[in-house]
């Protein structure tokens, strides 16, 4: 399958990834998260149509099955297909450390 | 967060593997695919309501923005975890070959 | 465009305290956090610590926990490294630096403060 | 010692390719990403790489980075007499924080 990134939907409507300004309050992360008090949060939005970035053999399998089987099997899904780390100062029972987290902010997208 | 496994939306409603009964003519596999003739294909299925099976942090994120802008960041979506190879009898040029794919099963679920 | 401006060298002796700066512009000062970073001669770059100068929340290095002080004014969008009481030892070529938004990498640093102490 | 390991020295001449390599532990690289500061001499750290495999605008293709497992690397085609610098790798590690490779001498020969 063509592993397409054409979005037949019109420009925009397609698995692909969005920025989203959030603040620590937003993510609910308040209460533990010191730094940074504003993340622009990257995540996978968009409709993932017939071969439309289709992560794998499933996505091709789950799209076919869906046009099948509208009711029972839903479409693939935009989810990440990779991550950029972060790192956040975050509060301690002794004060503030470093934390990386690796799985925090959308890197690229894939349809699942 | 808690990673939760006990559905509140009710039993069997939640993000888990389903499996759906397909012939090479539903997967769209008739052309190249000689055997097997059909598949219990496993997939994932269900709502993800806040914490159940979350991935990651990422997940998480994406639930609370979810919960301030829904019309503009969707809910997390059920997808694999990991997956089950398979081998299929395939049609060459020349004949037959085994060929394994190690994406085309869902193994187990969570949401992201 | 973005600048980190460092204040310049100084000799010192053992003993005496010492102040350096980085002055940042051309970016909002309070949204990246600015890391300290030693170079001693003819040797590889060491991380000392980290700033937020929206909070002043700071985190060092264990090799350098204890012995010098981070700090910043964001009102005159500056950092700061200090020292109470020098030793031979602190010889070296200091440079600050400011972190990328997601605050794994360095994407812009000072020219760096070569600092002398000795006898 | 440094927590990340680079050779000390690579050579080669124009217009050939050279890597530099990065070896850590699965307290740093092995988990996390990696980042490459280039250093001409008596000049401060430039960013060249970050998060394993991505150039900063202004930044020539002629570099890249790739991550396997435990080691990073560091690849500079077409290799020109201005890439004569000292080069560091930099991580994440638990323990420390912010830690860099000990750093590599690239030396343009003829």
């Known amino acids: 399958a063509r592993n397409g990134d054409r979005c037949p939907l019109g420009p925009g409507r397609c698995c692909r990834l969005h920025t989203v300004h959030a603040s620590l309050e937003d993510l609910g992360w308040a209460d533990w998260v010191l730094s940074p008090r504003e993340v622009q949060v990257t995540m996978c939005i968009g409709a993932c149509p017939s071969q439309f970035r289709e992560a794998n053999m499933h996505a091709q399998i789950k799209m076919n099955l869906h046009r099948l089987k509208p009711d029972t099997v839903p479409a693939p899904c935009c989810v990440p297909a990779s991550y950029n780390p972060m790192v956040l100062i975050q509060k301690t029972d002794t004060g503030v450390s470093l934390q990386t987290y690796d799985d925090l902010l959308a890197k690229d997208c894939h349809c699942v | 967060a808690r990673n939760g496994d006990r559905c509140p939306l009710g039993p069997g409603r939640c993000c888990r593997l389903h499996t759906v009964h397909a012939s090479l003519e539903d997967l769209g596999w008739a052309d190249w695919v000689l055997s097997p003739r059909e598949v219990q294909v496993t997939m994932c299925i269900g709502a993800c309501p806040s914490q159940f099976r979350e991935a990651n942090m990422h997940a998480q994120i994406k639930m609370n923005l979810h919960r301030l802008k829904p019309d503009t960041v969707p809910a997390p979506c059920c997808v694999p975890a990991s997956y089950n190879p398979m081998v299929l009898i395939q049609k060459t040029d020349t004949g037959v070959s085994l060929q394994t794919y190690d994406d085309l099963l869902a193994k187990d679920c969570h949401c992201v | 465009e973005v600048q980190l401006v460092q204040s310049g060298a100084e000799v010192k002796k053992p003993g005496e305290s010492l102040k350096i700066s980085c002055k940042g512009s051309?970016?909002?000062?309070?949204?990246?956090?600015i890391g300290w970073v030693r170079q001693m001669p003819g040797k590889g770059l060491e991380w000392m610590g980290v700033?937020?100068?929206?909070?002043?929340?700071?985190i060092y290095s264990p090799s350098f926990q204890g012995q010098v002080t981070i700090s910043a004014d964001k009102s005159i969008s500056t950092a700061y490294l200090q020292w109470s009481s020098l030793k031979a030892s602190d010889t070296a070529m200091y440079y600050c630096?400011?972190?990328?938004?997601?605050?794994?990498?360095?994407?812009?640093w000072g020219q760096g403060t070569l600092v002398t102490v000795s006898s | 010692q440094s927590v990340l390991t680079q050779p000390p020295s690579v050579s080669g001449a124009p217009g050939q390719r050279v890597t530099i390599s990065c070896s850590g532990s699965?307290?740093?690289?092995?988990?996390?990403?990696v980042n490459w500061y280039q250093q001409l001499p008596g000049t401060a750290p430039k960013l060249l790489i970050y998060?394993?495999?991505n150039r900063p605008s202004g930044v020539p293709d002629r570099f890249s980075g790739s991550k396997s497992g435990t080691s990073a690397s560091l690849a500079i085609t077409g290799l020109q007499a201005e890439d004569e610098a000292d080069y560091y790798c930099?991580?994440?590690?638990?323990?420390?924080?912010?830690?860099f490779g000990g750093g590599t001498k690239l030396t343009v020969l003829g």
């Open positions: 630096a400011r972190y990328g938004r997601y605050g794994t990498y360095f994407d812009y």
């Open positions: 699965s307290s740093n690289i092995g988990v996390l990403y």
């Open positions: 051309g970016y909002s000062f309070t949204s990246y956090w």
């Open positions: 930099q991580s994440w590690d638990s323990s420390s924080n912010y830690v």
């Open positions: 998060s394993n495999d």
């Open positions: 700033i937020d100068p929206s909070g002043s929340y700071t």
